[in-house]
């Protein structure tokens, strides 16, 4: 007897973080034997949507013409082949921004920081919120932090970073949210440019030194203060 059908791949274009009113396309890719694709949304009646496969039958498109609160959430997809339904895909978390007013992002003591020292990014909201998210432009893992103060409403969140290295430099934004839906975020804060100057680093070349300047896990503050990461929006904890 054959084993279970391999799970499909689920992704969103242009991405999984979408501003209110913008369009998004959800793709589910299975196998060439797929006859039908099904998309389920957590806490919604299943199936949320069904689609026939696009030629050559190995994927289906689910379109959202205008992003609203109703579409934000956690999705999984399946495909049906002649032998039955596949395993579920890994979840896709579709996040809508623009649900609340934008917070303010600042750097303490300054956005100009010397390599080898520390900097704390402070995200402040006008109204009390319980979840704050920090993102870095062009990062390999753009959603850096989800933090929750165990339901406690606060006006700010601190994101400590140390030691700062050259890859921490770049443009950051933050979002705020309420715990009842981790998929609804505020408008983004105005961008904050973090500039890393000087160097306390070893000047000798390292044989394993990365030549890529793209921001990756290396520039990510991995332990948000006082937080217990939620399952939703979790991007880079182990």
């Amino acid at each position: 007897q054959a084993g279970p059908l391999p799970k499909p791949t689920l992704w969103a274009e242009p991405g999984s973080v979408i501003s209110w009113g913008n369009s998004v396309t959800i793709w589910c890719q299975g196998t060439l034997e797929a006859r039908e694709y099904r998309l389920d949304k957590e806490e919604s009646p299943a199936p949320w949507d069904r689609q026939n496969p696009l030629e050559p039958k190995n994927k289906a498109r689910f379109s959202i013409p205008s992003m609203t609160e109703d579409y934000a959430g956690r999705y999984r997809c399946y495909y049906r082949s002649p032998v039955g339904w596949s395993q579920p895909s890994d979840p896709l978390e579709l996040v809508m921004t623009g649900a609340y007013s934008k917070p303010t992002l600042s750097a303490l003591p300054s956005p100009l920081v010397t390599s080898g020292k520390s900097v704390t990014l402070l995200c402040q909201s006008r109204s009390p919120m319980d979840t704050f998210l920090l993102i870095k432009e062009r990062a390999a893992h753009p959603l850096l932090h989800l933090r929750s103060e165990h339901g406690a409403q606060q006006h700010q969140a601190e994101f400590p970073m140390s030691p700062v290295t050259s890859v921490h430099g770049g443009t950051y934004r933050c979002f705020s949210s309420h715990g009842f839906s981790h998929y609804l975020l505020s408008h983004p804060s105005d961008p904050l440019e973090l500039i890393v100057s000087g160097s306390l680093e070893d000047p000798r070349p390292s044989p394993t030194r990365s030549v890529s300047t793209a921001a990756g896990p290396e520039d990510q503050p991995l332990m948000p203060t006082g937080s217990v990461p939620h399952s939703g929006l979790r991007r880079h904890w182990e």
Epitope: L108, P109, S115, G116, K117, S118, T120, E158, P160, M161, S162, P163, T165, S166, V167, L200, E201, D202, R204, S206, T208, R209, S210, S212, G216, P217, E218, Q220, P221, L222, M223, T225, H236, E238
Partner: antibody
């Protein structure tokens, strides 16, 4: 579960060399900066070196700069400390530790002992 | 380098006591202060990071506070398993530096 296991310690003559290894498991090694910290007998902890997750940033304590080299092999989940021109004051228990990105070291190995003596 | 001073090198207390260990830094470290526990067998564990944040799995009887140059670790309701040496460490500026340690013993 995060697990760090150091190896490579032992008795070394003054002026000699030694390479320590730290095998990591239970987490995505390539996503974390790593440290070496040492503790001389009956003394406190002393930070030795740091290497960022992609090896693009490396820092040393002044006491070891020019003599020690920290490196890592991400595909093999292994951290290294190459020690040369060893001195009696380098005698210590050497620990590897995982960096958090917030100035702390959240998981430590059990340590490997290095004795520099003739 | 930032100097770290733990003025009390050893401390004796009774089970159930509330114990406070102090750490002073030579300059403002902006709350980048961490506390570690080293057991007699050499095992080192992170207890508190960023002054007051409890590391996962650490009992809630441990707490941290402070700002600027003065920080403290408090153990409420001292337990037998808390017998260890406690080190503070600043993570504000490399090189990272440790306090000399405070050895906690049971009366």
């Amino acid at each position: 579960e995060v697990h760090l296991v150091e190896s490579g310690g032992g008795l070394v003559q003054p002026g000699g060399s030694r390479k320590l290894s730290c095998a990591a498991s239970g987490f995505t090694f390539s996503s974390f900066g790593m440290h070496w910290v040492r503790q001389p007998p009956e003394k406190g902890l002393e930070w030795v070196a740091y290497i960022s997750s992609g090896s693009s940033s490396i820092y040393y304590a002044d006491t070891v700069k020019g003599r020690f080299t920290i490196s890592r092999d991400n595909p093999k989940n292994t951290l290294f400390l190459q020690m040369t021109s060893l001195r009696s004051e380098d005698t210590a228990m050497y620990y590897c530790a995982r960096g958090t990105g917030t100035g702390a070291m959240d998981y430590w190995g059990q340590g490997t002992s290095v004795t520099v003596s003739s | 380098d930032i100097q770290m001073t733990q003025t009390t090198s050893s401390l004796s207390a009774s089970l159930g006591d509330r114990v406070t260990i102090s750490c002073r830094t030579s300059q403002d470290i902006s709350n980048y202060l961490n506390w570690y526990q080293q057991k007699p067998d050499g095992t080192v564990k992170l207890l508190i990071y960023y002054t007051s944040k409890l590391h996962s799995g650490v009992p809630s009887r441990f707490s941290g506070s402070g700002s600027g140059t003065d920080y403290s670790l408090t153990i409420s309701n001292l337990d037998q398993e808390d017998i260890a040496t406690y080190f503070c460490q600043q993570g504000n500026t490399l090189p990272w530096t440790f306090g000399g340690g405070t050895k906690l013993e049971i009366k």
